[in-house]
């Protein structure tokens, strides 16, 4: 019996079946939905938990504007095809051979199409804009108090390098978070930046991915911070193709989520 | 010792069901995995689908999906594969085996399906 | 799904001989191989898990290499016990799946 036998669990992904039998006898984890071995000790790729989850039994501005290139999920959940790696696929098709392209959290970033479309390569998301809504407090939150119980939250709780945490800005009651993570400044081993931004996105909204962790608990010197609004923005290393139509009207249609 | 024991030799008509069981012993049924796989007359393995006895989670291959139903009785350490509306290509020896890397395999199941 | 391939289909050899058979992947799957031995009428038995790694009771020149996509199977010095089928199979993701299988028979 080893250790792992002992306790073979996840700790950071819920939505796994835990045997002992991966290489040399130890605990291996497999995610619901691809079976996919997945790394316990780091979080699980966005590409395997959305599919996981498909398969189981939502004056001086201090605050970021998205640029004109900002994606926003307005897709909202389905099911991808992950490489062997648990990265999102390029092209992704649904069921009825509805084709489009996606960047590496899973974002839509072309006019849907047929099996005929070509996705070249998977476009990573460099810049991560999470824009939080906290509920009413008495007072505004310290913005340094603030910045760095999120640092650490980020550090901590998602083991994202603190260098990929670019700022916090804050302008009561709006938060934004900005992550930003270039190719060649992610080495192995670092967190992506979009994994971490889901994983803090399920954290939000109250359904946590870790094993048996209780549910996130964010306090600001001692008081806690509520939220009651995210929107998220991806802004990708090459800008997203849409038609003019989708450029004018859809950018502007965003979820929110409650 | 690990092993797996099996049910006996089933001949059902076209359009049938039939009931197949494995029955563990020698280790914790509820910590690993079993699968199913079969093999018809001549031919090679073919996965039809794994059970996780522990929480009943069942996957199957996409071929199976409408027709195989995969159960786990925890009391008494015993896997099921219940196959419907069976045609004559089912005929074959069906066989549970454990973990990923099926390091156990029961002894067989022969089903015959024939009019 | 991940098919997996097995060469040669047929293999002829004789007692003491060196066997090597081959399995290729159509994408890349790590270490998540398994090889087995068949004989008539029986069920299949574990010879190598994890592309290289030996079973308790499998007799030593039974050995296994390779990752990614390219994976194979070496029996050092052929036994008469040795002429069966041989199946690869991965565990990788869902669906397992098999290879179909390379023929050892005595030549």
């Known amino acids: 019996h080893t250790a792992a036998q002992d306790n073979c669990t996840c700790p950071t992904n819920k939505m796994t079946v835990c045997s002992p039998d991966g290489p040399g006898g130890r605990c291996q984890c497999r995610a619901l939905g691809s079976g996919m071995a997945v790394d316990c000790s780091t979080l699980t790729s966005k590409c395997l938990l959305l599919k996981a989850r498909m398969s189981a039994p939502k004056n001086a501005r201090t605050l970021v504007r998205p640029s004109e290139h900002a994606l926003v999920d307005n897709d909202g959940l389905y099911d991808p095809d992950c490489d062997p790696e648990g990265r999102f696929k390029a092209r992704q098709c649904n069921q009825t051979s509805v084709c489009w392209c996606v960047n590496s959290v899973g974002v839509r970033r072309t006019d849907k199409g047929d099996l005929s479309l070509r996705c070249d390569e998977l476009v990573r998301t460099h810049h991560i804009l999470i824009d939080l809504r906290h509920r009413p407090t008495a007072g505004a939150f310290n913005h340094s108090d603030l910045d760095a119980e999120l640092r650490r939250l980020f550090r901590e709780r998602y083991r994202l390098h603190p260098k990929f945490v670019a700022a916090v800005h804050y302008e009561q009651p709006t938060i934004q978070i900005e992550l930003r993570q270039n190719t060649s400044q992610k080495a192995a081993g670092d967190v992506d930046i979009g994994d971490a931004a889901y994983y803090f996105e399920r954290d939000i909204k109250g359904e946590s991915l870790f094993q048996g962790r209780g549910g996130l608990d964010l306090r600001v010197r001692g008081e806690p911070l509520q939220v009651e609004r995210t929107l998220i923005y991806y802004l990708d290393e090459i800008p997203p193709k849409f038609s003019m139509k989708r450029l004018t009207h859809h950018h502007h249609h965003h979820h929110h989520h409650h | 010792q690990v092993q797996l024991v099996q049910s006996g030799a089933e001949v059902k008509k076209p359009g049938a069901s039939v009931k197949v069981s494995c029955k563990a012993s020698?280790?914790?049924?509820?910590?690993?995995?079993i699968h199913w796989v079969r093999q018809a007359p001549g031919q090679g393995l073919e996965w039809i689908g794994t059970?996780?006895?522990?929480?009943?989670?069942?996957v199957y291959n996409q071929k199976f999906r409408d027709r195989a139903t995969m159960t786990a009785d925890r009391s008494i350490s015993t896997a099921y594969i219940e196959l419907s509306r069976l045609r004559s290509d089912d005929t074959a020896v069906y066989y549970c085996?454990?973990?990923?890397?099926?390091?156990?395999w029961g002894q067989g199941t022969t089903v015959t399906v024939s009019s | 799904e991940i098919v997996l391939t097995q060469s040669p289909a047929t293999l002829s050899l004789s007692p003491g001989e060196r066997a090597t058979l081959s399995c290729r992947a159509s994408q890349n799957i790590g270490t998540s191989i398994h090889w087995f031995q068949q004989k008539p009428g029986g069920a299949p038995r574990l010879l190598i898990k994890?592309?290289?790694e030996s079973i308790s009771g499998i007799p030593s020149r039974f050995s296994g290499s390779g990752s990614g996509t390219d994976f194979t199977l070496t029996i050092s010095s052929l036994e008469p016990e040795d002429f069966a089928v041989y199946y690869c199979q991965h565990s990788h993701s869902w669906p397992f799946t098999f290879g179909q299988g390379t023929k050892l028979e005595i030549k």
């Open positions: 085996a454990r973990a990923s890397y099926f390091d156990y």
């Open positions: 020698g280790y914790t049924f509820t910590t690993h995995w």
């Open positions: 994890y592309a290289s």
């Open positions: 059970i996780f006895p522990s929480n009943a989670y069942a």
